[in-house]
């Protein structure tokens, strides 16, 4: 089990101001650490680039929703 107390924390200090096409997104993770000044979502793109986004924005929520559905649907 990882040491949560000493594990390094990733925080976002600025958010992208561009909407990213869902076709370019591979995965996401939520940043809700009490060590971070802002709640955030980090999207990983299909070329492995990480982008900080504002979870309050509708396109961000829609993108997470889309990725969740992709995860739930088994690839045949």
């Amino acid at each position: 089990q990882p040491d949560a107390i000493n594990a390094p924390v990733t925080c976002c200090y600025n958010f992208t101001n561009r909407k990213i096409s869902v076709q370019r997104l591979a995965s996401y993770r939520r940043i809700t650490s009490s060590k971070c000044p802002k709640e955030a979502v980090i999207f990983k793109t299909i070329v492995a680039k990480e982008i900080c986004a504002d979870p309050k924005q509708k396109w961000v929520q829609d993108s997470m929703d889309h990725l969740d559905k992709q995860t739930q649907t088994p690839k045949t």
Partner: antibody
């Protein structure tokens, strides 16, 4: 062992004010957690009021609590909840709760026993 | 908004039986952002499960959490009389929206 204890619950008149205190022992706020206040009206469910980062002091509120309730870290072991313009609907047991670690998604593994706030004329 | 709704409000189960409690989120919260609590009268809630399916320390393996997206389930198997309590789900997806972060609760009565 790790413990939270709430204090300050009282009988207060409508439109009155009250400050609740949550005192931690067995751990320090220098280890980052979300410290939150949760209330439960008699016979009702759990309602989150506000949370504060124990390390950097970032705060979040339920929309209905904004402006009337203020969460603060007052020392390395205490968190307070200031409540103003109280109404009968604020009558509840108020719990202090701490997340399992610094992340919001791991749930509250430490709770105080609660303190009763009664608003009545 | 991430409003949590629980069903049923109350359920009766015999000792040794199985009970299933459902929790629905008003929008997707992913597959690892849900916690479950047990609360007995006069006591604070007790964390049972976090991360949708991870048992909290000291919790019996009779409790099982599952689900993803908007639909989540708590299953209690081999029910014991000590399981009589109210159970709550809680979203762990966002701290920015605290309104209705807890479900309304499900009272489990063991006969």
């Amino acid at each position: 062992q790790e413990q939270l204890v709430e204090s300050g619950g009282d009988l207060v008149k409508p439109e009155g004010s009250l400050t609740l205190t949550c005192t931690a022992s067995g751990f320090s706020f220098s280890t980052s957690y979300w410290m939150c206040w949760v209330r439960q009206a008699p016979g009702k469910g759990l309602e989150l009021i506000a949370c504060i980062s124990s390390s950097i002091g970032v705060t979040y509120y339920a929309s209905w609590a904004e402006g009337r309730f203020t969460i603060s870290k007052t020392s390395s072991t205490t968190v307070t909840l200031q409540m103003t313009s109280l109404t009968v609907a604020d009558t509840a047991t108020y719990f202090c709760a701490r997340t399992t670690d610094d992340n919001w998604n791991v749930g509250f593994n430490l709770w105080g026993p609660g303190t009763l706030v009664t608003v009545s004329s | 908004a991430y409003d949590m709704t629980q069903t049923p409000a109350s359920v009766e189960v015999g000792v040794g039986g199985t009970v299933t409690i459902k929790c629905q989120a008003s929008q997707s919260i992913g597959n690892r952002y849900l916690s479950w609590y047990q609360q007995k009268p006069g006591q604070p809630p007790k964390l049972l499960i976090y991360g949708t399916s991870t048992l909290a320390s000291g919790v019996s393996s009779r409790f099982k959490g599952s689900g993803s997206g908007t639909q989540f389930t708590l299953t209690i198997s081999g029910v014991e009389s000590a399981d009589s309590a109210t159970y709550y789900c809680q979203q762990g997806a966002t701290i920015s929206y605290l309104d209705n972060a807890f479900g309304g609760g499900t009272e489990v009565v063991v006969k």
